[in-house]
């Protein structure tokens, strides 16, 4: 990969091992855990990153009310099965043969079952709502400055096309970033909103996935934007299928 050529490292993914063992002795970077060669000029898929992480030697408001069908990643970390494209396989199972269906960001969207569980297709997450609460500041941030800074961040750091950042809402101290990307909108080479959201989430937690770059230093007009809590909601093109028992719990 040309992005990794100079000193054989992967700028966009520190969870790789790079070696001059590609065609013609070129630098090639493989994701930990899966061994899949990754493109270091763009973001690595969330599935490969999760696999690498598991294998590594660790009222009239402007705010959006998440839809009743929105999913939150309550299950936490697991060692996923990725397809040859690096995407999540629709059906995931653990070591004890408990299986469940996931969406394109790897979040469970059905009740857990056994090996007979069928997941016919990988359902796309087309709308992601990132809900942030920032630490107290002297005053509120200017909404348009905040909007511009977050859009710049997603465009420059995560290489997400600006058209996929649908909106930035702000009601101190809550910031909401809406990412939208339908299957029909996503062209070859476009960063997936799920991958961008995952990189952002890890950045916010101080666990940057970028090689050698400093952590995320978010500033709005020179004022540090420090996030104290993050909640991410995922909305799928087809609503999830949970039993009533879970919905009423």
């Amino acid at each position: 990969h040309t992005a990794a050529q100079d000193n054989c490292t992967c700028p966009t993914n520190k969870m790789t091992v790079c070696s001059p063992d590609g065609p013609g002795g070129r630098c090639q970077c493989r994701a930990l855990g899966s061994g899949m060669a990754v493109d270091c000029s763009t973001l690595t898929s969330k599935c490969l990153l999760l696999k690498a992480r598991m294998s590594a030697p660790k009222n009239a408001r402007t705010l959006v009310r998440p839809s009743e069908h929105a999913l939150v990643d309550n299950d936490g970390l697991y060692d996923p099965d990725c397809d040859p494209e690096g995407r999540f396989k629709a059906r995931q199972c653990n070591q004890t043969s408990v299986c469940w269906c996931v969406n394109s960001v790897g979040v469970r969207r059905t009740d857990k079952g056994d090996l007979s569980l069928r997941c016919d297709e990988l359902v796309r997450t087309h709308h992601i709502l990132i809900d942030l609460r920032h630490r107290p500041t002297a005053g509120a941030f200017n909404h348009s400055d905040l909007d511009a800074e977050l859009r710049r961040l997603f465009r420059e750091r995560y290489r997400l096309h600006p058209k996929f950042v649908a909106a930035v809402h702000y009601e101190q101290p809550t910031i909401q970033i809406e990412l939208r990307q339908n299957t029909s909108q996503k062209a070859a080479g476009d960063v997936d909103i799920g991958d961008a959201a995952y990189y952002f989430e890890r950045d916010i937690k101080g666990e940057s996935l970028f090689q050698g770059r400093g952590g995320l230093d978010l500033r709005v007009r020179g004022e540090p934007l420090q996030v104290e809590r993050t909640l991410i909601y995922y909305l799928d093109e087809i609503p999830p299928k949970f039993s009533m028992k879970r919905l009423t719990a």
Epitope: H1, C8, V17, S19, P20, D21, G22, P23, G24, G25, Q28, L32, G33, S34, G35, M36, A37, V38, D39, T42, P57, C82, D83, P84, E85, G86
Partner: antibody, heavy 116, light 113 residues
């Protein structure tokens, strides 16, 4: 030129362990993946796992987990593959190989015979 | 795991004739990031380690005679020997190194008719 030289044949009793070595020369040992491949008598090739000596990252084929341990000593540019709790089914030729798109470099193979 | 299936299991071809070995993988071996197929072909003679012939599905390893060629993409691959020579008698294996665990085909034994 690149060379991988493996240790000699071994005869072991069931239940014993064996450690096969693979000494690399002619290239920078720490920056290439090195894999181990098994070939039972008259059978095909099976990938057992690999190691990246520079950072000691190791991957195992699920089939061989608990049976094989792969290590490397960067000071001597030598990789090791240890088989534990040997059974007759472990009788095979074991190869080390430098991995990668254009890595046509294999050791000569080490025959491990398990017999009571 | 990716399953590699070769056909035929054995093949007898006359000297100077074309020999064709097929390899089918259970999942695509095409990496969308770099458009590279992670498939290699090896030749193994009795008592010897495998010898790399082709990598990236179609790139000939240096020193390999040009009668050997590889083709295919995704899940279907072919190794062709355009004019069989006596020294080509061996077992041929395809291998995926796309995703762990790397896997080999069961092998194709090539003989002279």
């Amino acid at each position: 030129q690149v060379q991988l030289v493996q240790s000699g044949p071994e005869v072991k009793k069931p239940g014993a362990s064996v450690k096969v070595s693979c000494k690399a020369s002619g290239y920078t040992f720490t920056i290439y993946w090195l894999g181990w491949v098994r070939q039972a008598p008259g059978q095909g090739l099976e990938w057992m796992g690999n190691i990246f000596p520079g950072s000691a990252y190791i991957n195992y084929n699920e089939k061989f987990k608990g049976k094989v341990t792969i290590t490397a000593d960067t000071s001597t540019s030598t990789a090791y593959m240890e088989l534990s709790s040997l059974r007759s089914e472990d009788t095979a030729v074991y190869f080390c190989a430098r991995e990668g798109s254009n890595s046509g470099y294999w050791g000569q193979g080490t025959l491990v015979t398990v017999s009571s | 795991d990716i399953v590699m299936t070769q056909s035929p299991d054995s093949l007898a071809v006359s000297l100077g004739e074309r020999a064709t070995i097929n390899c089918k993988s259970s999942q695509s071996l095409l990496n969308s990031g770099n458009q590279q197929n992670y498939l290699a072909w090896y030749q193994q003679k009795p008592g010897q380690p495998p010898k790399l012939l082709i990598y990236g599905a179609s790139t000939r390893e240096s020193g390999v005679p040009d009668r050997f060629s590889g083709s295919g993409s995704g899940t279907d691959f072919t190794l062709t020997i355009s004019s069989l020579q006596a020294e080509d008698v061996a077992v041929y294996y395809c291998q995926s190194d796309h995703i762990y665990p790397y896997t080999f085909g069961q092998g194709t034994k090539l003989e002279i008719k």
